[in-house]
């Protein structure tokens, strides 16, 4: 799957939306790699 910075950001936004924002504080685009998905 796409691992560019923009793809990672959009995937994380989707994950946050689906989880209702209940994730670790450091779960932000610049801290996560593609393996997080």
């Amino acid at each position: 799957s796409c691992n560019t910075a923009t793809c990672v950001t959009h995937r994380l936004a989707g994950l946050l939306s689906r989880s209702g924002g209940v994730v670790k504080d450091n779960f932000v685009p610049t801290n996560v790699g593609s393996e997080a998905f």
């Epitope: 959009h10 685009p29 801290n31």
Partner: antibody
């Protein structure tokens, strides 16, 4: 309110370098990647590179063959784009841009910095 | 690099018209495409990401579709403030690349 505020217009001679700044506010600067994009007069947008402000890791458009350097000052929440060995074709408006999730999910752009390269 | 070919390069339309702009990628980019609106002397404004998702605050008359290599931006009923240049962008691969733009002018 999220804002990306860029430095002012620059006029440079061919062969010189220019360093454009982009000060971020209204969000956690180190959480989101920062992109740099330019647009020459009447031309399409052109992506130059991005930086992870947290780690300092960068990706560059190889078209610029090492002429571009993107850096950040985390303490000042500011990103920089330096372009060296300027030529007339580098005359363009340079933009910083970042996709933010919190507080508002949006793709924010700076106002642009005009760089003119002329002898 | 992936080429993004936009068509038409310009079009004339009237307020209330339905406008369709297409973008073709030179290779598969999945749905990793964004659309931007730009007015003269202004920074681009993001409209669409992931081919079909509108950012908050973007009017519902703007819609995007497509996957793979073929993408479309549709303005269902053109408004006076929509006269601008529109760009597509792929972010599936580095370097990100943009289409050549479509200028939407008043007929």
């Amino acid at each position: 309110e999220v804002q990306l505020v860029q430095s002012g217009a620059e006029v440079k001679k061919p062969g010189a370098s220019v360093k454009v700044s982009c000060k971020a506010s209204g969000y956690t600067f180190t959480d989101y990647y920062m992109n740099w994009v330019r647009q020459a007069p009447g031309q399409r947008l052109e992506w130059m590179g991005d930086i992870n402000p947290n780690s300092g890791g960068t990706n560059y458009n190889q078209k610029f063959k090492g002429r571009v350097t993107i850096t950040v000052d985390k303490s000042a929440s500011t990103a920089y784009m330096e372009l060296s060995s300027l030529r007339s074709e580098d005359t363009a408006v340079y933009y910083c841009a970042s996709i933010i999730i919190v507080p508002n999910y949006f793709d924010y752009w700076g106002q642009g910095t005009t760089v003119t390269v002329s002898s | 690099d992936i080429q993004m070919t936009q068509s038409p390069s310009s079009l004339s339309a009237s307020v209330g018209d339905r406008v369709t702009i297409t973008c073709k990628a030179s290779q598969n980019v999945d749905t990793n495409v964004a659309w931007f609106q730009q007015k003269p002397g202004k920074a681009p404004k993001s409209l669409i990401y992931s081919a079909s998702y509108r950012y908050s605050g973007v009017p519902s008359r703007f819609s995007g579709s497509g996957s793979g290599t073929d993408f479309t931006l549709t303005i269902s009923s053109l408004q006076p403030e929509d006269f601008a240049t529109y760009y597509c962008q792929q972010y599936n691969n580095y370097p990100y690349t943009f289409g050549g733009g479509t200028k939407v002018e008043i007929k």
